[in-house]
Amino acid sequence: AVNGTSQFTCFYNSRANISCVWSQDGALQDTSCQVHAWPDRRRWNQTCELLPVSQASWACNLILGAPDSQKLTTVDIVTLRVLCREGVRWRVMAIQDFKPFENLRLMAPISLQVVHVETHRCNISWEISQASHYFERHLEFEARTLSPGHTWEEAPLLTLKQKQEWICLETLTPDTQYEFQVRVKPLQGEFTTWSPWSQPLAFRTKPAALGKDT
């Protein structure tokens, strides 16, 4: 393990998973590293092996229990350490006292479906996955629609500042193929970030009726 510029970032999915990424410039690909979790008020310790995801980046998931079980609370602290093997010993490369509900990243929304589609509008719904009941309604969403001839990066973001698991897209073009994505973020947590984007939902608006104004 070379002393390059390193970064250790972890997020809690609010239920039973802590996902971590460790990056280090100049580190050898075959360096053996792991994340060790030591909670302050739980009986368990957990370790996961960091596996390469790119040239200088490794990731692993600390799976704390069944996907929908509430394994940590707002008062928990979990000390997370990156340990890398150097010869016969393990060296601490990074350490943080991790507060799960200050470092949230939820799972991507799932079960996207078209509820109703017309020539100029489309109503879409979705569900959140493995989200803690602690949030109650304190969630927000961002959505984006991919129009023909554009990229996802160009798509304007629609913000839903409340727990609203549906959207009505307006001013669409008739008989046109679109794609739609949504992501979610709890309002809680200094280091909380957006979930990954959902899988895109493809839909097509209805064609305009012949001989009528559109």
Epitope: S6, F8, W38, D40, I77, I95, Q96, D97, N103, E190
Partner: nanobody, 126 residues
Framework: QVQLVESGGGLVQPGGSLRLSCAAS????????MSWVRQAPGKGLEWVSS????????YYAESVKGRFTISRDNDKNTLYLQMNSLKPEDTAVYYC???????????????????RGQGTRVTVSS
């Protein structure tokens, strides 16, 4: 904005003790790793000790290990450095420092220091 105010420095004889304090404000203190660094007369900044956000991990420079103890009181937003068995070579201005995240990197202990206070002077002399 981040404010770090050190106190507790002074003149002490070799073998004596001092306790430095650092009052922090302007950020969620318990969410950040903290450290003490020092600057001896005519020298550069030297890392002394670091502590994780909840105080569960502490690290020390070899030159102070066994003599200095870092601690924190998150209810009081205060960082401490207990200095025992002081030596003339400990003479320096001591700065309280905040890291840019909750993470501390032991192999590169000065990395990520984002803010520091005005410092408190410690003189060890007979």
């Amino acid at each position: 904005q981040v404010q770090l105010v050190e106190s507790g420095g002074g003149l002490v004889q070799p073998g004596g003790s001092l306790r430095l304090s650092c009052a922090a404000s302007g950020f969620t203190f318990s969410n950040y790793a903290m450290s003490w660094v020092r600057q001896a007369p005519g020298k550069g900044l030297e890392w002394v000790s670091s502590i994780t956000g909840a105080g569960r991990g502490t690290y020390y420079a070899e030159s102070v290990k066994g003599r200095f103890t870092i601690s924190r009181d998150n209810d009081k937003n205060t960082l401490y450095l207990q200095m025992n068995s002081l030596k003339p070579e400990d003479t320096a201005v001591y700065y309280c420092a905040k890291y840019d995240s909750s993470t501390f990197y032991p192999p590169t202990p000065a990395r990520g220091i984002a803010d520091r206070g005005q410092g408190t002077r410690v003189t060890v002399s007979s």
